[in-house]
Interface confidence: medium
């Protein structure tokens, strides 16, 4: 059988091979479709209610003015030419409908790294056959059940039109330290071949990197906290909590008498500045959290170790809060 695909609602003409171009003709069409119990026979004489669905044209072709889902099936024509030679035509008709452009609804504007997040729901309406939805990350296909990707799919069929609505909900677990602005898109692939996929507009949620509550981050510049005499060290206390907590500083376990600030600068380091520093973040909602402690030490000239750029002028190694 020859495969024929026709778009729902469009006309379709099936040729009856070997039939004389005009009457009188000896031919018959046999149909086995969603509209028939078994085989339905149509002749050139026609007439009756079937004419609105399918009728034989003067040249012997079968004409369907508007193909519907029920017209899927087998169409056969048997024709005899003027010399009595018999020719058979055999068609398998499949119908299709391209849906509207798929859309991502309920899209997330922010994802949290390290935990499963719903990215959004992709919806395609009005397809036949159903087809499939697939997700893409930065243009590359996402494979469900791989690397923290899961997809929940749902297919519904319209009770009157018979067309399909597809839904696909994407859940991902973004990797920590990964792309802070990934691009997701969704595409609909038709169930019948030779038709292009339809892609949604992309979405670009922001990935938020949570730091566990107990992790108040203390960063030292230069790394290691070892500097030459007269060098400068900066200590930065970073807490991702919103609103920003108050940051206080401690040296050797004793609070420093300084106003709260996220950065502590130790200019023109002298022996009195050596010690162990930490910061304490005080949240309004939960109690204080202390960072790890870092050791600030002076490298005597000639010693190995990282150095900070020295600064001009002479000072007493006073603490400066930044």
């Amino acid at each position: 059988a020859q495969n024929i695909t026709a778009r729902i609602g469009e006309p379709l003409v099936l040729k009856c091979k070997g039939a004389p171009k005009k009457p009188p003709q000896r031919l018959e069409w046999k149909l086995n479709t969603g509209r028939t119990e078994a085989w339905k026979v149509l002749s050139p004489q026609g007439g009756g209610p079937w004419d609105s669905v399918a009728r034989v044209l003067p040249n012997g072709s079968l004409f369907l003015p508007a193909v519907g889902i029920q017209d899927e099936g087998i169409f056969r024509c048997q024709a005899m030419n003027r010399n009595g030679k018999e020719t058979k035509s055999n068609y398998r008709v499949r119908v299709y409908q391209i849906p509207g452009k798929p859309e991502i609804v309920d899209s997330a504007s922010e994802l949290t790294a390290g935990v499963p997040n719903k990215v959004g729901t992709c919806v395609s309406e009005g397809s036949y056959p159903a087809g499939t939805l697939s997700w893409h990350l930065d243009g590359k296909p996402l494979v469900p059940n791989e690397k923290g990707v899961s997809v929940k799919e749902q297919t519904r069929r319209h009770p009157e039109t018979g067309l399909f609505t597809l839904q696909s909900e994407l859940m991902v677990t973004p990797a920590r330290g990964g792309d802070p602005r990934p691009t997701f898109s969704c595409s609909f692939s038709p169930g019948l071949p030779r038709h292009r996929a339809l892609r949604t507009a992309p979405i670009q949620p922001r990935v938020w990197e949570p730091v566990p509550l107990e992790e108040v981050q203390l960063v030292v510049e230069p790394e290691g906290g070892a500097v030459a005499p007269g060098g400068t060290v900066t200590l930065t206390c970073e807490v991702p909590a919103q609103p920003s907590p108050q940051i206080h500083w401690m040296k050797d376990g004793v609070p420093l008498p300084l106003p709260p600030s996220p950065v502590l600068i130790l200019p023109e380091i002298g022996p009195q500045d050596q010690g162990t520093y930490s910061c304490v973040a005080t949240h309004s909602s939960h109690g204080p959290q202390e960072s790890r402690a870092v050791s600030i030490s002076i490298i005597e000239p000639g010693e190995e170790g990282p150095t900070a750029g020295s600064v001009g002028g002479s000072g007493l190694g006073t603490l400066a809060l930044a």
Epitope: G177, P180, V219, E221, E223, T234, L258, P259, S261, I265
Partner: antibody, heavy 115, light 107 residues
């Protein structure tokens, strides 16, 4: 010596995105913060935010939270700033700056947003 | 946000003079203020941090002072190469904020 080499000037259309780079050399990239600063003619300097390449933590000025995305590539010692949904208000010179002390600045990159 | 106000947009001085550039913070920022110099067509250059500490290589004619809300950058014995715009910046609170700048003109 310490250097921050920024990418060349950019001319982009409104609504587009752009990613500008800042290549660090002469020091340990992962040991110092990289700040980004915006300068519009006659409008002074605005702090956008920082990234710490050592752990890829970021801190943004709320004003730029939905405009700028800061990233860093340790392997190439390069910090990046992506600016999205560009408008004429984003036309400016953008500087990258090393460290909380702000002791070294890149040469700046001129971004022009125009149709 | 903390507002850093440099009330004088322009200052005119002569070579050899002493000039004071002022900066006022809208709230207490301790000594967490830096000063930057920006020459035409160049990126800013760090001069002073922690209100009064000079960076390496900065001539000692540049002096910073102040704490709390009032800060001053003093340039003594002004040189022609000091023709530039000077910005203050606070880093006591996020977001870091800059003053609007003071342009120094040499007569």
């Amino acid at each position: 010596q310490v250097q921050l080499q920024q990418s060349g000037p950019e001319l982009v259309k409104p609504g587009a995105s752009v990613r500008i780079s800042c290549k660090a050399s002469g020091y340990t990239f992962t040991s110092y913060f990289i700040h980004w600063v915006k300068q519009r003619p006659g409008q002074g300097l605005e702090w956008i935010g920082w990234i710490y390449p050592g752990n890829v933590n970021t801190k943004y000025n709320e004003k730029f939270k939905d405009k700028a995305t800061l990233t860093a590539d340790k392997s190439s010692s390069t910090a990046y700033m992506q600016l999205s949904n560009l408008t004429s208000e984003d036309s400016a010179v953008y500087f990258c700056v090393r460290g909380q002390l702000g002791d070294y600045w890149g040469q700046g990159i001129t971004l022009t947003v125009s149709s | 946000d903390i507002v850093m106000t440099q009330s004088q947009k322009f200052m005119s001085t002569s070579v050899g003079d002493r000039v004071s550039v002022t900066c006022k913070a809208s709230q207490n920022v301790g000594i967490n203020v830096a000063w930057y110099q920006q020459k035409p067509g160049q990126s800013p250059k760090a001069l002073i941090y922690s209100a009064s500490y000079r960076y390496s290589g900065v001539p000692d004619r540049f002096t910073g002072s102040g704490s709390g809300t009032d800060f001053t950058l003093i340039i003594s014995n002004v040189q022609s190469e000091d023709l530039a715009e000077y910005f203050c910046q606070q880093y006591n609170n996020y977001p870091r904020t800059f003053g609007g700048g003071t342009k120094l003109e040499i007569k």
